[in-house]
Interface confidence: low
């Protein structure tokens, strides 16, 4: 779901942002501006800062203060400067459902001035109201307590679906509210364990009733796990085919540092995986390499504007990093290597992480070290090379004329199965080999078009390669002749 | 993750100027509130001034207020501190730290090595 | 402005004995941060929201505490965790006063 714009017609102003939340930022600029005092393991925590989006400031403000929380909302420029939120004192009743019930009052009122009813419709309220904060109050977890913060009380009330379509960050990012990333990273039971490799493992999780993953990374990768909460905390990267971040926590757990990473969680699997299983007729071919190239284009792109976003490279795509959704469709997953660059700035943000890309899937360029790595170009036309290798695992196991390839790894039949970087610079650059096209593929239309395709994504020369946008229009055009094809037999 | 190297200490008379600069790498630079700390010889830790990410809030000590000056380009990934009228009291090594906010409630921080500044005549 | 006594100044521990230092507010504060300085070297973080340690550090190290008392403890001292530490309590707003520090040193 993309983030929701702010309303054509809604005045933006400038509010103050105080708390650690505010990524080091002591301003932002929102449809709302709000002060918040909220309770976090027995202390006060007060924050400042701004909605972006008129909804969640709704949701929040009309949210009468609790014995837990009170949030004070207000519009205008630097409104929220000297507004400091009060927790009720015990035994006043609160302000929120004052204002509530006399507005209910007036109703009733004008209906059938019962007036002793609106008082039994006040107390039995109230003290509904009274029980409901004390359960919330409740510690959800032993281990770890739940981080009553703003925000939290709509969290508990909400699924991920709302949170997330109506969420603002105190950047630009495409996650919660940072308040909110820890409450529901705290909220997590974990089911069991789908997957595990040299990252860690990634677990299927339950957050309120709904299914999450939870990638818990291994110390060694830790800068992997800071890379990717950096980049889906500053950048807006809320696109149906790039995996869905919820939050991201550190936790100490049985006396060890926990790095998570909670996403959206998708049963189907990794691409990897699903091409071993299953065998793919055109239109499932072309839905899943046209959802890959779609969120490849949308990460290489640089958006301008509020709700705009850095461009990004993504340094690890293969069939292991991408999804596979229930509609189809794909997306990509695992941005610890990711690059960014923005073009007004110029800067590149390489990160620093030690960890390098799949050997297998390694552009020539990367190979013998000939990569101009102050570049942003350079990592895109990698990324090029590897979906080139991705769109030919996929294309292998798409069906004609009854004849299927069996799923096979890139260079399978060349090197070994975990091949040194050795290995793939002989195979790569120095013999330039590539994978081999099948000749069944020529005796169809489609996988005629996808030989084409993939071999213009391994050209030696980089700078020759297609760009993500080319291909993704190239696709595009390939499934709409299909449909063609379909309406006029 | 950030790196940080300092540069532009030395020895300086009471009353002269110093620039310090601190370049930054391996991040977005714009992404981390930046803040120079202190540290007299056999002292403790002092934080000296911070600066928020666009340059929007600066704030400084109370010893370095009107003396001092914190700034960033984002354009060249560093960040510098103009300092004026120096005192003998200002003799220390600095270090650069870069924060960033990640989703809870405290920062982590990266610093430099530190650059040494000298004030004696 | 919230001031920031550390205790001791000065502590020597014998390998395997159990150290707590302690950080004691001059008004009630949320959380505490730690810094661990070794002679010549930068500081490092070294234990965040009172009682998170941060990457790489020692299971042997341990934070807590509440309002305007907080401590830092090692349940067995090891030859390398000779340093300095110093307690940081981060406001929304500056001044961030540090510490004065605690020298733990080996017997």
């Known amino acids: 779901v993309e983030d929701e714009k702010p309303k054509v017609n809604q005045k933006l102003y400038m509010c103050v942002c105080e708390g650690l939340s505010c990524g080091n930022e002591d301003h932002c600029e929102g449809q709302q501006c709000f002060s918040s005092l909220s309770i976090n393991d027995g202390f006060h925590v007060y924050q400042k800062g701004c909605f972006q989006v008129y909804e969640q400031g709704k949701m929040t403000c009309k949210t009468p203060p609790s014995p837990g929380q009170a949030v004070e909302c207000c519009q205008g420029d630097w409104c929220n400067r000297n507004i400091t939120a009060q927790l009720p004192t015990k035994g006043k009743s609160f302000p929120g459902t004052q204002n509530f019930h006399l507005e209910v009052g007036l109703i009733i009122l004008s209906v059938v001035f019962a007036v002793c009813l609106l008082a039994c419709i006040l107390g039995v309220a109230l003290r509904k109201f009274k029980r409901r904060n004390q359960e919330r109050l409740n510690p959800r977890d032993v281990e770890y307590g739940t981080i009553e913060g703003l925000i939290t009380t709509n969290v508990g009330d909400s699924t991920l679906a709302e949170l997330l379509d109506h969420s603002c960050t105190s950047g630009s990012g495409s996650g919660l509210p940072f308040l909110v990333q820890r409450t529901v990273a705290r909220q997590i039971t974990l089911l069991e364990c789908v997957g595990k490799g040299r990252y860690g493992e990634v677990w299927r999780g339950s957050w309120q009733g709904e299914n999450v993953a939870v990638k818990i990374f291994s110390s060694r990768d830790e800068k992997s796990w800071f890379r990717e909460t950096e980049l889906y905390n500053t950048v807006m990267l809320r696109h149906e085919n790039i995996l869905g971040f919820i939050a991201s926590d550190m936790t100490s757990r049985h006396s060890s540092t926990q790095l998570w990473l909670i996403t959206h969680y998708h049963e189907m699997g990794s691409l990897y995986d699903y091409l071993q299983l299953t065998t793919l007729d055109t239109v499932s071919c072309l839905r899943i390499v046209l959802s890959i190239a779609s969120g490849l284009a949308h990460l290489h792109i640089e958006i301008f504007g509020t709700q705009g976003k850095s461009a990004i490279a993504h340094r690890d795509l293969k069939s292991k990093n991408i999804l596979v959704k229930k509609n189809g469709q794909c997306c990509i997953a695992d941005l610890g290597l990711a690059v960014m660059h923005s073009q007004s700035t110029n800067q590149l943000d390489v990160g620093n992480n030690p960890r390098v890309g799949t050997k297998r899937y390694m552009a020539p360029e990367v190979l013998d070290e000939t990569i101009q790595v102050d570049c942003f170009d350079s990592y895109k036309r990698v990324d090029i090379w590897a979906f080139g290798l991705v769109l030919w695992e996929v294309a292998r196991r798409m069906v004609s004329n009854g004849i299927v390839e069996d799923y096979k790894p890139p260079f399978y039949d060349v090197v070994p199965n975990d091949p040194s970087f050795e290995d793939m610079r002989k195979v790569v650059c120095v013999d330039q080999q590539r994978p081999n096209i099948p000749n069944r593929w020529f005796s169809d239309p489609t996988l005629t078009s996808l030989a084409k395709l993939m071999k213009e994504c391994w050209y030696q020369n980089p700078s020759a390669r297609l760009t993500a946008l080319r291909i993704k229009k190239t696709l595009t055009k390939i499934d709409n002749s299909l449909d063609k094809l379909k309406t006029d037999c | 993750e950030v790196q940080l190297v300092e540069s532009g200490g030395g020895l300086v008379q009471p009353g002269r100027s110093l620039k310090l600069s601190c370049l930054a790498s391996g991040s977005t630079f714009s992404n981390y509130g930046m803040k120079w700390i202190r540290q007299a010889p056999g002292k403790g830790l002092e934080w000296v001034a911070s600066i928020s990410r666009s340059s929007t809030y600066i704030y400084y000590a109370d010893t370095v207020k009107g003396r001092f000056t914190i700034s960033r380009d984002n354009a060249r990934n560093t960040l510098y501190l103009q300092m004026t009228s120096l005192r003998s009291e200002d003799t220390a090594l600095y270090y650069c730290?870069?924060?960033?906010?990640?989703?809870?409630?405290?920062?982590?921080?990266?610093w430099g090595p530190g650059t040494v500044v000298t004030v004696s005549s | 402005e919230i001031v920031l006594t550390q205790s001791p100044t000065t502590m020597a521990a014998s390998p395997g004995e159990k150290v707590t230092l302690n950080c004691l507010a001059s008004s009630s504060v949320s959380y505490m941060t730690w810094y661990q300085q070794k002679s010549g070297a930068s500081p490092k973080l070294w234990i965040y929201g009172t009682s998170n340690l941060a990457s790489g550090v020692p299971n042997r190290f341990s934070g807590s505490g509440s309002g305007t008392s907080y401590s830092l403890a090692i349940s067995s001292m090891e030859a390398e965790d000779v340093a300095t530490y110093y307690c940081l309590h981060l406001t929304s707003y500056p001044p961030y006063t540090f510490g004065a520090g605690t020298k733990l040193e080996l017997k």
């Open positions: 730290a870069a924060a960033i906010s990640t989703p809870f409630y405290w920062y982590f921080d990266f």
